[in-house]
């Protein structure tokens, strides 16, 4: 029959070539002379000439060694023709299977593999996976089946077998406990890949295992005891820098320190922060310390890390004895701002108040007083007693120096320390009103027509406070009442001036006396310009000229 079974040819055959593989034969050769040929890739198309056929005998020939890793199977067609070139058979499929030889070593996909694992993990923990490939066949043979193994480990601490590798997958895992980054931060494994499922050719690569840091070391104070000196009253003052050592990875959360004042800071006087570079604890004053109240503080500070400990660890504690140093403190006025009510216009030399300061220092220091700021120059202060007296006329209505009835004075106290220190106090004199101002009309100049004159309304003002103001009373004096009338309105805060007799055009003085509710009288001269006109006028018209 015109058929041929699949032909198996081992790769890398040593010849001699051409090598006879199989004979094509048509049973039509009994009737006529047959000529054989082959076509297909490997025969008449690339790669050409690998196979040939003896034209007359039908022997299939291999011309050169085969490489399975290049081409694993050839599919050719066999042809049979008669002498006249007529085809005597249908084209026949010829399959040539190249069988594998173990002619390739495994190859790792990288020369160096890198992986990492947390220190202190249990055995069984996966680290990384390595991969090797082998071009040989791994389906029908073991030629390309790779088995992985660890050849060596450096360093060999704490055991020479800290890791193992899955023989089939290449996954490296931890097999021994005792991974300690602080002792061995990195392991170098020489790994092997062997084909024939472990019985063939071997290749090696390197797997570097980085041991990652876990917070398995507590920060420790070094030293554990400190003595510091701090001047009293200093806020934000650096008291002491506390130093810790931590074996964990520098600048990691497992290394960075967190400080906590555990005891001794009853008044919440201190605070502690972590220096970002040195990791030191910087102890500073949050509030001023008072030597006179407590001259020594013993603080207990505990240190932990930003990251939680992965296991139970003893925490380190430092003791800091803070000695408070005495400083000459400024006298303090009591109260710092003193409000005193005093009548305006009191006689010169009259006492206003006593305003004194206390010295926080325990020594009996002498305090002297003086006025620091007295804008109007109205007061004097006894340097020894702190007695404030009037030396000028206190005027509530003085708008330059008095605001909202209050006259503000700054006083100074100085001790006799070395060097001397000063403190200031504020004296707020609330000036009580007296009826020292009479009512005043506004405006004091008017223009009025001498025919059908319009009544002139004048506002009345009084610098004093109620009850020394309205209702006001008006009276015309010096014969002004012959030509004029003055009447206060119902509210008592305006006066209406009217012309009651004809006056020729001119300027006249109207003598108006106003008195307030407290009968304080004020005489005011109103300048009245009388115009030749009717009704309302603002300025006198010019003389009339006929045409």
């Amino acid at each position: 029959d015109w058929v041929v079974a699949p032909i198996s040819v081992p790769e890398n055959g040593k010849g001699p070539f051409p090598q006879r593989l199989n004979q094509l034969k048509s049973n039509k050769d009994r009737d006529t002379k047959i000529f054989y040929s082959i076509t297909g890739p490997g025969a008449d198309s690339p790669p050409e000439g690998v196979f040939a056929v003896e034209k007359e005998t039908g022997w299939l020939l291999l011309n050169k060694p085969l490489d399975r890793e290049e081409i694993a199977k050839y599919e050719l067609f066999g042809h049979a023709v008669s002498e006249n070139g007529a085809s005597v058979e249908d084209p026949m499929n010829i399959s040539i299977i190249v069988t594998d030889q173990n002619d390739h070593k495994p190859k790792f996909t990288q020369d160096t593999f890198r992986g990492s694992v947390l220190e202190g993990v249990l055995p069984g923990t996966s680290v990384m996976q390595v991969t090797a490939t082998d071009e040989d066949d791994a389906i029908y043979t073991y030629n390309g089946v790779v088995a992985y193994s660890i050849h060596s480990q450096e360093p060999k601490d704490p055991h020479d077998l800290m890791f193992t590798i899955h023989r089939s997958t290449g996954t490296i895992s931890v097999i021994s406990s005792g991974l300690d980054r602080e002792k061995v931060p990195e392991y170098t494994l020489t790994i092997q890949a062997t084909d024939m499922d472990g019985d063939g050719s071997t290749t090696t690569a390197v797997a570097v295992v980085e041991i990652l840091d876990a917070n398995d070391n507590a920060p420790m104070f070094d030293p554990q005891k400190y003595e510091a000196h701090v001047p009293e009253n200093a806020v934000g003052h650096e008291v002491q820098r506390l130093t810790v050592t931590d074996l964990d990875a520098p600048n990691s959360p497992a290394w960075r320190a967190t400080y906590l004042i555990m005891g001794g800071d009853d008044g919440d006087h201190f605070t502690i922060t972590t220096h970002p570079e040195s990791n030191q604890g910087i102890l500073t004053t949050r509030k001023g310390l008072d030597f006179e109240a407590k001259n020594q503080h013993t603080l207990y500070v505990e240190v932990t890390n930003e990251a939680p400990f992965v296991l139970k660890l003893p925490t380190s504690t430092a003791t800091i004895v803070v000695h408070v140093e005495d400083v000459n403190e400024a006298p303090v006025f009591v109260p710092p701002s003193k409000v005193v009510e005093v009548q305006e216009g009191i006689p010169t030399g009259e006492p206003v108040c006593v305003y004194t300061a206390e010295d926080p220092d325990k020594e009996n220091q002498k305090i002297s007083y003086r006025i620091l700021r007295d804008p109007a120059g109205w007061l004097a202060m006894d340097p020894d007693s702190g007695q404030v007296t009037a030396v000028g006329t206190l005027d509530r209505e003085d708008e330059q120096f008095v605001r909202n009835n209050i006259y503000e004075v700054m006083v100074l106290a100085m001790d006799n320390g070395s060097p001397p220190t000063t403190g200031t106090g504020t004296l707020l004199l609330t000036l009580i009103d007296v009826n020292d101002h009479g009512p005043v009309p506004e405006p004091r100049q008017i223009t009025i027509c001498n025919q059908s004159p319009v009544r002139q309304v004048l506002n009345i003002t009084d610098k004093d406070l109620s009850p020394h103001t309205s209702p006001f009373q008006a009276q015309l004096t010096d014969d002004s009442d012959i030509y004029w009338t003055a009447e206060v309105n119902e509210e008592g805060d305006t006066v209406v001036l009217s012309l009651k007799k004809f006056l020729k055009q001119d300027t006249y003085d109207v003598h108006l006396s106003l008195s307030d509710h407290g009968n304080k009288e004020q005489l005011t001269v109103i300048r009245a310009t009388v115009c030749d006109c009717h009704g309302h006028v603002e300025t006198c018209p010019g003389p009339w000229k006929g045409g």
């Epitope: 947390l118 069984g124 193992t164 021994s176 406990s177």
Partner: antibody, heavy 117, light 111 residues
Framework: EVQLLESGGGLVQPGGSLRLSCAAS????????MSWVRQAPGKGLEWVSA????????YYADSVKGRFTISRDNSKNTLYLQMNSLRAEDTAVYYC??????????WGQGTMVTVSS | QSALTQPASVSGSPGQSITISCTGT?????????VSWYQQHPGKAPKLILS???KRPSGVSNRFSGSKSGNTASLSISGLQAEDEADYYC???????????FGGGTKLTVL
């Protein structure tokens, strides 16, 4: 030579607690993972819990998770097993075992825990 | 149900040889050469007799030997003696949180 000595076993009522200790000597304790393995009467070995050398990693069998706590004090070369909410099925000999560098176990002599009312 | 499968019992006469098998998977016995065997006499603690498939600790008789093929490890005892009567357990390393698997145990009876 590795030596492991368990203590703390005894009779306890269901729901009660016990704390087992295992004193180790003869090896660098902190470099070895430690385990508790138990054996119920007439039964095989059952792995209960394990702890890494530093104490940073632990493992528990599902049957004891949430009830048992393994811990170690490397400064005292001692392994502990705190057993709470004990049940009748926790009755067994409890062995302390060290996981050596050859991936095998060295065993203590065991301590008996009986949970019964 | 144990992770590694052992026969429940084997027996042999004094002087004979016996083999106990321990079958796992390609992720434990088949993947690593970390199979150990332990001997346990009644009322006693287990004792290591083989580690890393076939390594005997000092003091263990050379009548005990181990081997592995594929996913199955074997413990062989030659020249059986009465004191060999005990329970035998195999263990294997595996990757994962349960890093060691136990066999169910095999009771060896010396007839």
């Amino acid at each position: 030579e590795v030596q492991l000595l368990e203590s703390g076993g005894g009779l306890v009522q269901p729901g009660g607690s016990l704390r087992l200790s295992c004193a180790a000597s003869g090896f660098t304790f902190s470099s070895y993972a430690m385990s508790w393995v138990r054996q119920a009467p007439g039964k095989g070995l059952e792995w209960v819990s394990a702890i890494s050398g530093s104490g940073g990693s632990t493992y528990y069998a599902d049957s004891v998770k949430g009830r048992f706590t393994i811990s170690r004090d490397n400064s005292k070369n001692t392994l502990y097993l705190q057993m709470n909410s004990l049940r009748a099925e926790d009755t067994a000999v409890y062995y302390c075992a060290s996981w050596g560098p050859t991936a095998s176990l060295d065993w203590g002599q065991g301590t008996m825990v009986t949970v019964s009312s | 149900q144990s992770a590694l499968t052992q026969p429940a019992s084997v027996s042999g006469s004094p002087g004979q040889s016996i083999t106990i098998s321990c079958t796992g998977t390609s992720n434990d016995v088949g993947a690593y050469n970390y199979v150990s065997w332990y001997q346990q006499h009644p009322g006693k603690a287990p004792k290591l007799i083989l580690s890393e498939v076939n390594k005997r600790p000092s003091g263990v008789s050379n009548r005990f030997s181990g081997s592995k093929s594929g996913n199955t490890a074997s413990l062989s005892i030659s020249g059986l003696q009465a004191e060999d009567e005990a329970d035998y357990y195999c263990t294997s390393y595996t990757m994962g949180s349960t890093f060691m698997l136990f066999g169910g145990g095999t009771k060896l009876t010396v007839l």
